[in-house]
């Protein structure tokens, strides 16, 4: 896929900032509000921000230029750049009335057919787990074998770096094809197929992405706060896996949530399935020694592993990957359109 | 196991509120739907709301919107509901419910129940 | 809203016949569908999920079937404690609904 433009977004932050910059005013409210960031620490939802006045004026004057509003896209070019600019002008439009946090990125509803050639599997025994074929698929798929092998390499040995393992596991779900990447990682195994839900749980190289000892999950979300690419994809994660009814619908559509949690691989909110028998899925942390905020620790690690919202979208797609191969195809290439919510 | 324990029986007058709590033990509160169900004497069942504590998520049925209340106390464990302006129709037994979701297949049953709490409402 | 239509509203049986309780649902509802148990003065007890699942403990006499608007609850040899009111319930959308309930009374 090409990446998309800055033009192709309805309102670019980088592009924000460009107009900004030619308008003195706004251009000095701008580098105000961006010198207050170490006066103003970023708040946890428990937190209140203090604010200095000249930090509040900077703000206000802020709020009526095309930066509030502005916004970015996961695979653009310039995205760290784009979110840098995103969250500086957060701060104006949450200062002194503290609001939760917007996921910075813009939807763009691709339904670009996925390409597929099955007749090529026929070199797999016919009763291989469809994880296997589904990693056979990516095989097959030259830009998606060659990342596939450079987050391998990257994340495999004894001494294995994890900063670099995760930055390789971001680029591979950032850049491979959807299908490609969800197929990957959302295959479906046979409830006793111990082998296939394992081949599942390492997809993501477990032993070199995750941290070896599991650190508190607020300490985990502090340092994700930190950079402003893992928060935005644990902001945007957190608005589209939302539950909006106790069934389980959420709040926008399931494809939009299962983007946003295959956008969190490879930040430090590295999320993974946690056994070899079931699609339940975890982070990689522990609520124990949270003290007296047990409660938001427990809310944050929930929104993981006791979400029906994302638990129903897995599970559907798993389903959706399933019926591919269950299905007599007319020709061996066939296009599957992305698929679409059950909500 | 999650079990749960409603509140005594209630006698109130026509006009006044009830408040019926349910207090849960044997799992993580907080991670649970519970949905509130009534049955009138002789009656079918009948969903009220629910309530996801953990996402703050709850879901009114229409005829109960603007009626209902539903609550939850994590500290307790202790899921409420509470039902304004009644009228004699209230007369019911009102159960409390996890509604189980995470199941990763066709999702959300009610298991377990609470034993129920019997509302009598007198003119 | 979505409707659920059970029949029969009742029905008696004897010790060892094999019962069918139907439900219908006035729209497609997947497999999303449920079966309750409730003795008088009881709550009601979960026998069957998503159509054709059986909750753990319960006997394998009862098997649920069915899938869209046709669900179907048997009960392959009746036995006295199987005497009761039994609620289909569809979990596909909000509000969530039951059916009006079929009572299983002694022949």
């Known amino acids: 896929d090409p990446l998309p433009t800055e033009s192709r977004l309805m309102n670019s932050c980088l592009q924000a900032r460009r107009k900004c910059q030619a308008d003195p005013t706004c251009s000095a409210a701008y580098h105000h509000l961006d010198s207050c960031t170490s006066s103003i620490s970023t708040p946890l939802p428990s937190e209140e921000p203090s604010v200095p006045a000249d930090c509040l004026e900077a703000a206000q004057q802020l709020r009526n230029s095309s930066l509030i509003g502005c916004m970015c896209h996961r695979r653009m070019k310039n995205q760290v750049a784009c979110l840098d600019i995103y969250w500086t002008v957060h701060r104006a439009r949450s200062l002194g009335n503290y609001e939760l946090d917007v996921s910075p990125y813009e939807d763009t509803v691709t339904s670009k057919p996925w390409k597929m050639n099955l007749s090529k599997l026929n070199m797999l025994k016919p009763d291989s787990d469809l994880c296997l074929k589904f990693a056979m698929l990516c095989t097959l798929n030259d830009k998606c074998d060659r990342l596939r092998k450079a987050y391998g390499e990257a994340c495999s040995g004894p001494h294995c770096q994890r900063h670099v393992c995760l930055r390789q596991l971001l680029t591979f779900f950032e850049k491979a094809a959807e299908p490609h990447a969800q197929g990957l990682l959302l295959c479906p195994c046979a409830p006793n197929d111990r082998g296939c839900g394992e081949r599942r749980r390492n997809t993501i190289a477990p032993n070199c992405a995750l941290p070896p000892v599991a650190p508190n999950c607020l300490e985990l979300r502090r340092l994700c706060f930190s950079d402003p690419l893992c928060r935005s994809r644990l902001v945007d994660f957190q608005t589209h896996c939302h539950p909006m009814d106790i069934l389980g619908t959420c709040a926008t559509e399931q494809s939009r949530c299962l983007r946003a949690y295959l956008g969190l691989i490879g930040t430090a909110m590295t999320p993974n399935f946690v056994s070899n028998v079931n699609t339940s899925v975890a982070l990689s942390c522990t609520c124990r020694g949270s003290g007296n905020l047990q409660e938001e620790c427990e809310m944050l690690e929930g929104f993981f592993s006791h979400n029906p919202c994302l638990t129903e979208a897995i599970a559907a797609k798993m389903r959706f990957h399933s019926q591919l191969f269950s299905q007599d195809w007319p020709h061996p290439t066939f296009a599957v359109m992305a698929h679409q919510n059950e909500n | 196991e999650v079990q749960l324990v409603e509140s005594g029986a209630e006698v109130k007058k026509s006009g006044s509120s009830v408040k019926v709590s349910c207090k849960a033990s044997?799992?993580?509160?907080?991670?649970?739907?519970i949905s509130w169900v009534r049955q009138a004497p002789g009656q079918g069942l009948e969903w009220m709301g629910g309530?996801?504590?953990?996402?703050?998520?709850?879901n009114y049925a229409q005829k109960f919107q603007g009626r209902v209340t539903l609550t939850t106390d994590e500290s307790t464990s202790t899921a409420y509901m509470e039902l304004s302006s009644l009228r004699s129709e209230d007369t019911a037994v009102y159960y409390c419910?996890?509604?189980?979701?995470?199941?990763?297949?066709?999702?959300?049953?009610?298991?377990?129940w609470g034993q129920g709490t019997l509302v009598t409402v007198s003119s | 809203d979505i409707q659920m239509t059970q029949s029969p509203s009742s029905l008696s049986a004897s010790v060892g016949d094999r019962v069918t309780i139907t439900c219908r649902a006035s729209?497609?509802?997947?497999?999303?569908l449920n079966w309750y148990q409730q003795k008088p003065g009881k709550a009601p007890k979960l026998l069957i999920y998503?159509?054709?699942s059986l909750q753990s403990g319960v006997p394998s006499r009862f098997s649920g079937s069915g899938s869209g608007t046709d669900f179907t609850l048997t009960i392959s040899s009746l036995q006295p404690e199987d005497f009761a009111t039994y609620h289909c319930?569809?979990?596909?959308?909000?509000?969530?609904?039951f059916g009006q309930g079929t009572r299983l009374e002694i022949k």
């Open positions: 419910a996890v509604f189980y979701y995470g199941s990763g297949s066709y999702r959300n049953w009610f298991d377990p």
């Open positions: 044997g799992g993580t509160f907080s991670r649970y739907a």
């Open positions: 309530i996801i504590p953990l996402f703050g998520t709850l």
């Open positions: 729209q497609s509802i997947s497999s999303y």
């Open positions: 998503a159509a054709s």
């Open positions: 319930q569809q979990s596909y959308s909000i509000p969530i609904t």
